[in-house]
Interface confidence: medium
């Protein structure tokens, strides 16, 4: 494959490119003569003969772990050795479309696809994941239960950076004015727990009420915030005197 053996370039003898062109752009063979499609992440490269390929910008050809045979050809990159294209920068990046890409190479590939559809190119805005305001993954659910019961509300939120989650009790006053009381306050029958997860940049929070009293009835708000914004969701706790007062939806039992 040494380019010292390159003869005159005869484009007519070059293999044709795909009819729709190369998704990751064109490169040339070792002699700088025949056009070839640049290979993408995970695609074969190196090797010899028809299998020879070059990686797209931002990638490099590294030895494939899959094949161990043919060590004799290794020094010359001969047919016995194959490589695979890997991204040089193997960290997530944030695209101008607001999407987080696992690598700069995947962002470039997405940009090429966008341009091939006549859309705007996607550029790298920053290293690392794109920042995003919080959103509620799983909101708390309304609860009906009797005095003395143990109940809990849960709320799952996501955002980048990871949001801070707090719980408020919403108090509606006269003329529709509402105010919130940050929980747990001074209540000794109420506990709040928060933990990261289940996914990256997610937080799950719980309000545990035990024992439930009439004063605990009302609307509870799960509020998440980070540098990019805030989100909230709420649920009601209704305290009844007897279990038969709890409405049962079709196919569901009451949350006890």
């Amino acid at each position: 494959s040494s380019s010292d053996t390159c003869g005159p370039c005869e484009p007519a003898s070059c293999p044709p490119l795909p009819p729709l062109g190369c998704l990751l752009g064109e490169t040339r063979d070792a002699c700088g003569c025949c056009p070839m499609c640049a290979r993408g992440e995970g695609e074969p490269c190196g090797g010899g003969g028809a299998g020879r390929g070059y990686c797209a910008p931002g990638m490099e050809c590294v030895k494939s772990r899959k094949r161990r045979k043919g060590k004799a050809g290794a020094a010359a990159g001969g047919p016995g050795v194959s490589g695979v294209c890997v991204c040089k920068s193997r960290y997530p990046v944030c695209g101008s479309d607001g999407t987080t890409y696992p690598s700069g190479c995947q962002l470039r590939a997405a940009s090429q696809r966008a341009e091939s559809r006549g859309e705007k190119a996607i550029t790298q805005v920053s290293k690392g994941t794109c920042e995003q305001g919080p959103s509620i993954v799983t909101p708390p659910k309304d609860i009906w239960n009797v005095t003395g019961a143990q109940v809990y509300l849960s709320c799952e939120v996501i955002g980048i950076p990871t949001p801070v989650l707090i719980w408020n009790k919403v108090k509606r006053g006269h003329y529709g004015v509402q105010r919130t009381e940050l929980l747990p306050g001074d209540r000794d029958n109420l506990a709040i727990q928060t933990r990261g997860g289940p996914e990256k940049h997610e937080v799950t929070g719980w309000v545990l009420v035990s024992p439930l009293s009439k004063e605990d009835a009302g609307e509870y708000e799960c509020h998440a915030s980070n540098s990019q914004g805030q989100a909230s969701a709420s649920a009601k706790i209704t305290v009844v005197d007897a279990l038969h007062e709890i409405p049962v939806k079709k196919g569901e039992g009451a949350e006890l």
Partner: nanobody, 119 residues
């Protein structure tokens, strides 16, 4: 492996520019190539020169552009004469080199230098 292009700029139609691309790093270079990416278009091949001296040009630049290399300096040059407005593009240098022990040629790319030809 790092590539640094220079020599781009604004020039009147019919004028000349000389681009250069210097490579740094320890590796064996097989082929130097120049590509260009006109605004809103795909990257396209311009010229190539191999270590053995084989030279190849895109039809659109034949007779106007000349590629040359200085092996000692690990530098490639693109002399561009009789420039036309359609030559306006980001010119990107590319080398095919194998710095790895198993002898694969890797493509290495520069960041590009802007050439603008006004009419």
């Amino acid at each position: 492996v790092q590539l640094q292009e220079s020599g781009g700029g604004l020039v009147q139609a019919g004028g000349s520019l000389r681009l250069s691309c210097a490579a740094s790093g320890t590796f064996s270079i097989n082929t130097y190539l120049w590509y260009r990416q006109p605004p809103g278009k795909q990257r396209e091949f311009v010229a190539a020169i191999t270590s053995g001296g084989s030279i190849n040009y895109a039809d659109s630049v034949k007779g106007r552009f000349t590629i040359s290399r200085d092996n000692a300096k690990k530098t490639v040059y693109l002399q561009m004469n009789s420039l036309k407005p359609e030559d306006t593009a980001v010119y990107v240098c590319n080398i095919k080199a194998h710095p790895n022990p198993w002898g694969f040629d890797n493509d290495y790319w520069g960041q590009g230098t802007q050439v603008t030809v006004s009419s």
